[in-house]
């Protein structure tokens, strides 16, 4: 009688992560008596995947009824495949004994796993920056296989070119990660702007995956100040206004000083929003001229978003 052969008909099998993989194996004879075992890898470090005789293998099921006496099909199905399952699987026939001894191995089936990249996560700088400054954004996506992936950066739909991308690890791996850093120059009009990281991979049936960051979380637009004297409202009263224009974010505190002495402090509340997303605000101070013998120096002092105060002064002439 011809010697038993272990036949693994598939040289390679490719599976999507999350699916089940069927690994085929048949033997050509019922002799010698003894169990079948499945291993991943070869040599002393091989990993036992399934033992027909004993053990608990919750993700592995036999395709046919391997307990039947005449059974010669020892194909298995491995459920919920992840990239970590990739490798070469061997169907090995053992001869019954004490202990069982390895009799013959199949040629092996290479299991390749395709896995989608995770949704890209874009993160910006920890602190806000002002227009004309360059800030860095990072984009990360993980867990994909094969390694080939493309990553693009956009600002408001315009592709960016100043970025560096790494795919790790450099060598062979079950899955990969991508990390990219883009440099973006801020402008005063960027409150409504978005930075987008776009990742394309062979496993994606839809459009590329996108991660976004709103520049509103990154930018600080400092205000411009203008102090003006309004026409006299009453005989002894002058209305002085401080126009605080084009600032972002809204967090702003204004202090009026009369000849260096604090007169009033208020927080920006009823602001008006400009088309570009920045804010305007106006504060006014009613000055009683009759209380002053000399000219009055009025100062509008603004502390914006925790930054050092900026101020604008106005000299109020007191006529004798």
């Amino acid at each position: 009688e011809e010697e038993l052969q272990v036949i693994q008909p598939d040289k390679s099998v490719s599976v999507a992560a999350g699916e089940s993989a069927i690994l085929h194996c048949t033997v050509t004879s019922l002799i010698p008596v003894g169990p079948i075992q499945w291993f991943r890898g070869a040599g002393p470090a091989r990993e036992l995947i399934y033992n027909q005789k004993e053990g608990h293998f919750p993700r592995v099921t036999t395709v046919s009824e391997s307990t039947k006496r005449e059974n010669m099909d020892f194909s298995i199905s491995i459920s919920n495949i992840t990239p970590a399952d990739a490798g070469t699987y061997y169907c090995v026939k053992f001869r019954k004994g004490s202990p069982d001894t390895e009799f013959k191995s199949g040629a092996g089936t290479e299991l390749s796993v395709r896995a989608k990249p995770s949704a890209p996560v874009v993160s910006g700088p920890a602190a806000r920056a002002t227009p004309q400054h360059t800030v860095s954004f990072t984009c990360e996506s993980h867990g994909f296989s094969p390694r080939d992936i493309t990553l693009k950066w956009f600002k408001n739909g315009n592709e960016l070119s100043d970025f560096q991308t790494n795919v790790d690890p450099v060598g062979e791996s079950v899955s990969y990660s991508i990390h990219s850093t883009a440099k973006v120059v801020l402008t005063r009009e960027d409150v409504h702007s978005q930075v987008i990281c776009e990742v394309a991979h062979v496993t994606l049936q839809g459009d590329p995956l996108r991660g976004t960051a709103n520049l509103s979380e990154t930018i600080r637009v400092p205000p411009t100040l203008e102090v003006t004297q309004q026409p006299v409202r009453a005989e002894n009263q002058v209305n002085v206004t401080c126009q605080v224009r084009k600032f972002y974010p809204q967090r702003l505190q204004l202090t009026w000083l009369e000849n260096g002495n604090v007169s009033r402090t208020e927080t920006a509340s009823t602001v008006t929003e400009n088309k570009d997303g920045t804010y305007n605000w106006m504060s006014w101070l009613l000055v009683n001229v009759s209380a002053h013998r000399d000219d009055v120096k009025l100062t509008c002092q603004v502390e914006h978003d925790g930054q050092p105060a900026v101020s604008k002064s106005h000299d109020l002439k007191v006529s004798a």
Epitope: S12, S14, V15, R114, D148, T203
Partner: antibody
Framework: VQLVESGGRLGQPGTSLTLSCTVS????????MGWFRQAPGKGLEYIGI?????SPYYASWVNGRFTISKTSTTMDLKMNSPTTEDTATYFC?????????????WGPGTLVTVSS | DIQMTQSPSSLSASVGDRVTITCRAS??????LAWYQQKPGKAPKLLIY???FLYSGVPSRFSGSGSGTDFTLTISSLQPEDFATYYC???????????FGQGTKVEIK
Amino acid sequence: VQLVESGGRLGQPGTSLTLSCTVSGFSLSSYVMGWFRQAPGKGLEYIGIISSSGSPYYASWVNGRFTISKTSTTMDLKMNSPTTEDTATYFCARVGPLGVDYFNIWGPGTLVTVSS
Amino acid sequence: DIQMTQSPSSLSASVGDRVTITCRASQSINSYLAWYQQKPGKAPKLLIYSASFLYSGVPSRFSGSGSGTDFTLTISSLQPEDFATYYCQSWHYISRSYTFGQGTKVEIK
């Protein structure tokens, strides 16, 4: 799982023509779909694809000559201003479940003849 | 755009022969290569994807190999139903575009 093309006929140069690919057994919202053509006695040529979310992508030579769109059960190919060089059998196909690098299901094709 | 060069453009062989068709890409496509069989008046049928993976239901006499720029389709023992035209098709992961080889017609000797 099945794809069937329709709309192939004898058309005049410059007169737009729309081909349809009707799918059954799966959802168009889950797969990338493609259009291909084959001139008589020639090889296969890629025209374009439409993503599962409905975004079309075209071969570099297309230059606005074709428009790909889809509804819930059909994918359309509009030939905007056909010439006699567009005479061919047009195939629709679905990409494989593992990725967009190959096409595992094809329709039987529909013949378009452009002639004056 | 990537060019795919298939050779030979045609070949004559007998039943039982071992047949090899090659496909060369003008730049690396890694393993993103598929092989199709087409018979006259019919749609293409997928044989091999990812350069070496046999599509389900395809006889094991078909095999594919290669990566980068050079690829091979092998029919280990030609059967009467294998007389057809064979096409290679690449996918480029950067341009996300597809290109076909010009085809190889396998005829009866």
